[in-house]
Interface confidence: low
């Protein structure tokens, strides 16, 4: 079973102190292998996802995670209690809400159990690691007669998240793109009747609450508009 | 239930301060995050400031950030918001709301009233 891992661009805010042993032979020893880079994710502070890439290691390896948060009541070396796998060998850790504190510094430990020196340690800042759900419930009513409002909901507390509405019209090679804070409406103050218009939205834990840079998945759409798009050019072009 | 009580609101000059109050009497707050929001009339309910229950993690609007400053005691059962250099435009009613798991503000005070006079 291969498992699909959501990897980010980087976390500037991540830093990893990669603690290496080199044996004293001509060869080199396994301990000198560097292990591999682990990624967390804090989905909608529900869950966090600590993923490895397992098929880096020269041979299969179950690695160990231990985590623990720096400097603070929950200072305590725990070990990971729910693994995930990728072809039956450790790629991953799965926390839960209950092991998740935001705002204190997240150290995570990978370990090659066989070598026991052979370990890396990276600390996390998780308010900068957090993905929200999509945005749900998305409504759009006319404030007037070419005026359009667009609302929607998070899953999560609204002043945490900013978003990102994109909009277009089956006329529209393109998105058009407009960013909203916390406040999670948007007005589009002159639409054309004629045209069909398509919104969607996705949110990001950013800047009130953390500063995270990946945002959700998209939104499911919400049109709105005419459903004729007879005299759209580039519906020609593409059934010609 | 988790019963938020604000106080502390009132009358004030331009410039002055006041030091709002939200308690849990009697109990913790018992979740994640504390936060005070404000309505003008007529307006919309706005954030102004949030703690984490760590006490890290404190975030601001930007209308207030420099002039307000959210903290909470060690108990983390009581959390003040002092406001310093106060405008005509921060007349507000001002509430606290906590949040249990990130999700929503499950618990909401019934509101302090702050009016700043020029």
């Known amino acids: 079973l291969n498992t699909t891992i959501l990897t980010p661009n980087g976390n500037e805010d991540t830093t990893a102190d990669f603690f290496l042993t080199t044996m004293p032979t001509d060869s080199l020893s396994v301990s000198t292998l560097p292990l591999p880079e682990v990624q967390c994710f804090v989905f909608n502070v529900e869950y966090m996802n600590c993923t490895w890439n397992s098929s880096s290691e020269p041979q299969p390896t179950n690695l160990t995670l231990h985590y623990w948060y720096k400097n603070s009541d929950n200072d305590k070396v725990q070990k990971c209690s729910h693994y995930l796998f990728s072809e039956e060998i450790t790629s991953g850790c799965q926390l839960q809400k209950k092991e998740i504190h935001l705002y204190q510094t997240f150290v995570v430990q990978l370990q090659d159990p066989r070598e026991p020196r052979r370990q890396a340690t990276q600390m996390l800042k998780l308010q900068n690691l957090v993905i929200p759900w999509a945005p749900e419930n998305l409504t759009l009513h006319k404030l007037s007669e070419s005026q359009l409002e667009l609302n929607w909901n998070n899953r999560f507390l609204n002043h945490c998240l900013e978003h990102l509405v994109q909009y277009r019209t089956d006329w529209d090679h393109s998105w058009t793109e407009q960013s909203v804070d916390y406040r999670h409406k948007f007005s589009l103050p002159s639409v054309d009747g004629q045209k069909r218009y398509t919104f969607r939205v996705r949110s990001r834990f950013n800047p009130l609450c953390g500063s995270a840079q990946h945002w959700s998945e998209w939104s499911h759409p919400i049109h709105w508009g005419s459903n004729t798009s007879k005299e759209n050019p580039f519906l020609f072009a593409l059934e010609a | 239930q988790v019963q938020l009580v604000e106080s502390g609101g009132g009358l004030v000059q331009a410039g002055g301060s006041l030091t709002l109050s939200c308690a849990a009497p009697?109990?913790?707050?018992?979740?994640?995050?504390v936060g005070w929001f404000r309505q003008a009339p007529g307006k919309e309910r706005e954030f102004v400031a949030s703690i984490s229950r760590s006490g890290d993690g404190i975030y601001y609007d930007d209308s207030v950030k420099g002039r307000f400053t959210i903290s909470r005691n060690n108990a983390w059962n009581t959390v003040n918001l002092q406001m310093n250099s106060l405008k005509v435009e921060d007349t507000a009613v001002y509430y606290c709301?906590?949040?249990?798991?990130?999700?929503?503000?499950?618990?909401w005070g019934q509101g302090t009233q702050v009016t700043v006079s020029s």
């Open positions: 009697g109990r913790t707050f018992g979740t994640d995050v």
């Open positions: 709301a906590a949040g249990d798991g990130w999700s929503t503000y499950d618990y």
